[in-house]
């Protein structure tokens, strides 16, 4: 067969080839930031000629042109500057209200290089009607002036934009319009990861919400977990394999799924996932029909053996057949289940289709949609049922019409999207569920996304301060209580002055709590062994504090797991009937278990947990302190079974004022609390300019560093006397 | 807060011997680390020694480590720091601090002394 020619640069840019110069493969121009290609792609046809998809006239040269952002077609009640046909990367657009108006959303926005806006609409509203008036996006013009209930209001775009979002909103009896905000958009353009990552994580975490199986209430006999039965979702994924993948897209394709079943197996949920590829004829390698589909990892493996080569006798996009296997899927599942049972009703369904282009066979899949919304009785009523993610990748070739015909649309929401290419989709999966926006109190979830703060990152941790100044840290382990330790309180028991500080999405400083009441264990006496020779002792260094006021879950504040807890049980996925034992034995399961705690800036910080035959050299250490301990005859006199040791090679040591802070490790994208930080035999902050300085000991220091962390294991009896009414503790 | 007033200080020959006291006001300093600091003209303000609230562990820094020792009297509310083969270069003013957290960070501690002038010359 003849290839296509060579002469194909674009000036100031660079293509790849998804298969060489042979029919077939498929050219894609990329420019730099700013620029977009014009044509965007170019497909080697069996007549050894390039086609430029949709284009009519002859081949052009291919060119790289300024991005421009649409520029408003109306503004209701108040006017903008400049006025100008389209903006430039860079560009600002201000507006202000007449008077009587007030401005809601940015009242500056600047056009970014991928030829979208930032910031929010902006809308000059009185507050007159029912729903608050929707506005009119960038580039687009509205009909209906009327915000009543029932009221109706329809959007197009001008020129050549393209509409995503609803091109329809009703006013809704609880004053909020339906569908999604539509934003009109330039065809070439594309969504940045980072926006693309917080806007399907919020959206996926509204749902994961709706699932959470640990439904609690209230009983004579404490607090009871239900796991209903019933909370399940199905999460399909819809994998292109069609000719315009390369091989190494598609890797990143399964890699990006890889990852979501990953993230979405680390909430507790019961989930099942069907894994579905597709060029000219689907191929489900996972139905959520099979048991295996509710295992991680058996899932993960079934995506690890989907082929590239699967479809290469069939090469075109039939996205309506791939739909179409989730739709008769959903019907031998109903069949199988019972159409009016609950435990059909009570499944969510939410369906990703990745796709780097519009669907060019097996006709529209809008069809598939609506045979789906029809099957699963998807209404005003069971909106919350059914979510389509439809994600198209490379700008290319993607239609952003069918993009936004399947993705599901509902308010706040965006469910459309399209990324500049591969890499920017497995960033989006990367950190999509890092959000941790769950309003409940589901525990150990923190934001593991590159730009997350450092509270976001471990939002169980507070600060406690007995006057101004801080004193020890602590962690949260429910929306009311902390744990910490005992040693922080040696002022007797008026704890009236002492504050909690806890993380706050609203402040940077946190929010501050007065304790209610401090649960100091009464075992705790820094001089028991003072006649022995050891002039201070840390046996039972454990403490609770009870908030004067439940935390509001948030991205900053969240309780981390405690073991032995059926919260923790649910975020280990491990089966009903484990113990005390069980955790563990999974959780401090080698001789040198990877942990964490949290340094006075905020920051992460690392450590090794000596455990066996390791644990007793690393506290053997102790006998050299001779000043803390003069006439030391045996180390297990001060480092007693409940202390957990660290502080070998490269381990950080804590500081004094990191006493009580949680040590804590990470499984299965969730954070468990082994341990607290209690003593130690260096402190690296003493004496430094902030709490950004931190000392290394030198390598020659006698007695070299050794940290000493209360473990929880140890602790239980304790623990469940006086949290039994807080948490569920599983049998020891 | 902890109210401090260091005294002791004055001119020492080297290889003398100076020892200074720092009492506390407030029935509270039982419960406070304490700790010497000290700054020579010139100089950033540089940690020399702390004691635990327990009076149980010591530390040093390297440059004063065998000839300075730190001590209290918790019923005297009262902080030492007993200073042995003084060099010239011991030669600073020296604050007493109290610290309930244990770290003293520059930054954060509100709690100083007004100092007092050690002189070590021929």
């Known amino acids: 067969a003849p290839s296509c020619p060579q002469n194909v640069n674009i000036s100031g840019g660079t293509f790849t080839l998804s298969h060489g110069w042979a029919p077939g493969s498929l050219l894609t121009y990329s420019c730099p930031q700013g620029l977009y290609p014009s044509p965007a792609s170019r497909l080697c046809k069996s007549s050894g000629q390039w086609q430029t998809p949709g284009a009519t006239r002859s081949l052009s040269k291919a060119v790289c042109k300024p991005v421009r952002c649409p520029a408003p077609v109306s503004f209701e009640n108040g006017i903008y500057t400049p006025r100008l046909g389209s903006y430039p990367v860079g560009g600002n657009v201000s507006f202000e209200c007449e008077d009587g108006f007030i401005l809601r959303g940015s009242p500056v926005r600047q056009c970014r290089p991928n030829g979208m806006w930032d910031g929010e609409t902006a809308v000059c509203d009185n507050g007159a009607g029912h729903c608050p008036n929707p506005g009119i996006s960038l580039g687009a013009v509205r009909t209906g002036f009327r915000f009543g209930h029932g009221d109706k209001v329809r959007y197009r775009c001008s020129s050549n934009l393209v509409l995503t979002g609803s091109s329809e909103r009703e006013c809704q009896g609880n004053g909020v319009w339906s569908g999604t905000e539509p934003i009109c958009r330039q065809p070439y353009s594309y969504d940045f990861p980072e926006d693309v990552a917080p806007a399907l994580g919020t959206s996926f975490s509204h749902m994961l919400g709706a699932t959470n199986p640990t439904q609690k209430t209230k009983e004579s006999l404490g607090r009871k977990i239900q796991i209903q039965r019933s909370g399940h979702l199905n999460l399909y994924l819809l994998l292109d394999c069609s000719q315009s993948v390369s091989e190494n897209d598609f890797l990143i394709f399964k890699e990006s799924a890889s990852l979501m079943v990953d993230r979405i197996f680390s909430f507790e949920i019961n989930v099942s996932v069907a894994i579905i590829t597709f060029a000219s004829e689907p191929k489900v390698l996972m139905s959520v029909l099979n048991d295996n589909s509710r295992d991680m990892t058996e899932v993960i493996s079934s995506l690890e053996n989907a082929n590239y080569k699967d479809h290469e006798n069939g090469t075109g996009t039939n996205t309506y057949a791939a739909l179409n296997s989730v739709y008769l899927m959903m019907n031998n599942q109903m069949r199988l289940l019972g159409m009016e049972t609950m435990a059909w009703q009570e499944i969510r369904h939410a369906i990703i289709l990745l796709t780097d282009g519009k669907s060019n066979m097996g006709g529209s899949p809008k069809t598939a949609v609506d045979h789906i919304r029809e099957i699963l009785n998807i209404n005003q009523k069971r909106n919350d049922y059914l979510d389509i993610y439809a994600i198209g990748v490379g700008k290319l070739d993607v239609d952003w019409r069918e993009l936004n015909e399947l993705g599901s649309k509902k308010d706040g929401e965006r469910h459309a999207f399209i990324l500049q290419d591969t890499k920017a989709l497995h960033q989006v999966f990367e950190h999509m569920l890092d959000v941790s926006k769950l309003t409940d109190t589901i525990c150990g979830v923190g934001n593991m996304s590159a730009n997350a703060s450092d509270q976001e990152r471990t939002p169980w941790h507070v600060t406690i301060k007995p006057k101004s100044q801080e004193t020890c840290r602590g962690a949260l382990i429910s929306d009311q209580w902390v744990l910490t330790a005992a040693h922080c309180f040696r002022d007797g028991n008026d704890h009236s002055l002492w504050r909690v500080n806890v993380g706050d999405p609203k402040s940077q400083w946190g929010k501050e709590f007065l304790i209610e009441k401090a649960v100091i264990s009464p075992g705790f006496d820094v001089f028991a062994k003072k006649n022995q020779g050891i002039l201070e002792f840390y046996g039972d260094d454990i403490a609770l504090l009870k908030l004067a006021q439940k935390v509001k879950m948030s991205t900053h504040a969240r309780p981390i797991c405690l073991p032995c807890t059926m919260e923790a049980n649910l975020a280990l996925r491990r089966p009903q009937g484990s113990t005390c034992r069980d955790h563990e034995n999974e959780l401090l399961n080698k001789q040198s278990v990877p942990a964490h705690f949290v340094a006075l800036n905020g920051s992460k910080l690392n450590i090794n947990l000596k455990m066996g035959v390791e644990w007793t050299s690393c506290a053997e250490v102790v006998s050299q302190e001779k000043t803390m301990f003069p006439n030391l005859t045996d180390v297990r006199e001060v480092v007693t079974d409940q202390f957990l040791c660290s502080g070998t090679q490269e381990d950080e040591s804590p500081c004094k004022g990191e006493s009580g802070g949680a040590v804590f490790l990470e499984r299965r994208f969730r954070f468990f609390q082994v341990g607290l930080v209690s003593w130690g035999l260096y402190n690296p902050c003493l004496g430094s300019a902030d709490k950004n300085s931190r000392k290394r000991a030198p390598r020659s220091k006698v007695p070299p560093p050794r940290d000493f962390h209360i473990n929880l294991f140890r602790m239980q009896p304790w623990l469940r006397q006086h949290l039994g009414d807080v948490l569920n503790f599983l049998p020891l | 807060q902890v109210q401090l007033v260091e005294s002791g200080g004055g001119l020492v020959q080297p290889g003398g011997s100076l020892r200074l006291s720092c009492s506390a006001s407030?029935?509270?300093?039982?419960?406070?680390?304490m700790g010497w600091f000290r700054q020579a003209p010139g100089k950033e303000r540089e940690f020399v020694a702390s004691?635990?609230?327990?009076?149980?562990?010591?530390e040093y820094a390297d440059s004063v480590k065998g000839r300075f020792t730190i001590s209290r009297d918790n019923s005297k509310n009262t902080l030492y720091l007993q200073m042995n083969s003084l060099r010239a270069e011991d030669t600073a003013v020296y604050y007493c601090?109290?610290?309930?957290?244990?770290?003293?960070?520059?930054?954060?501690?509100?709690?100083w002394g007004q100092g007092t002038l050690v002189t070590v010359s021929s």
């Open positions: 601090a109290a610290d309930y957290s244990g770290d003293f960070l520059l930054s954060d501690l509100d709690s």
């Open positions: 004691i635990s609230w327990t009076g149980g562990s010591t």
């Open positions: 407030g029935h509270t300093f039982r419960s406070y680390y």
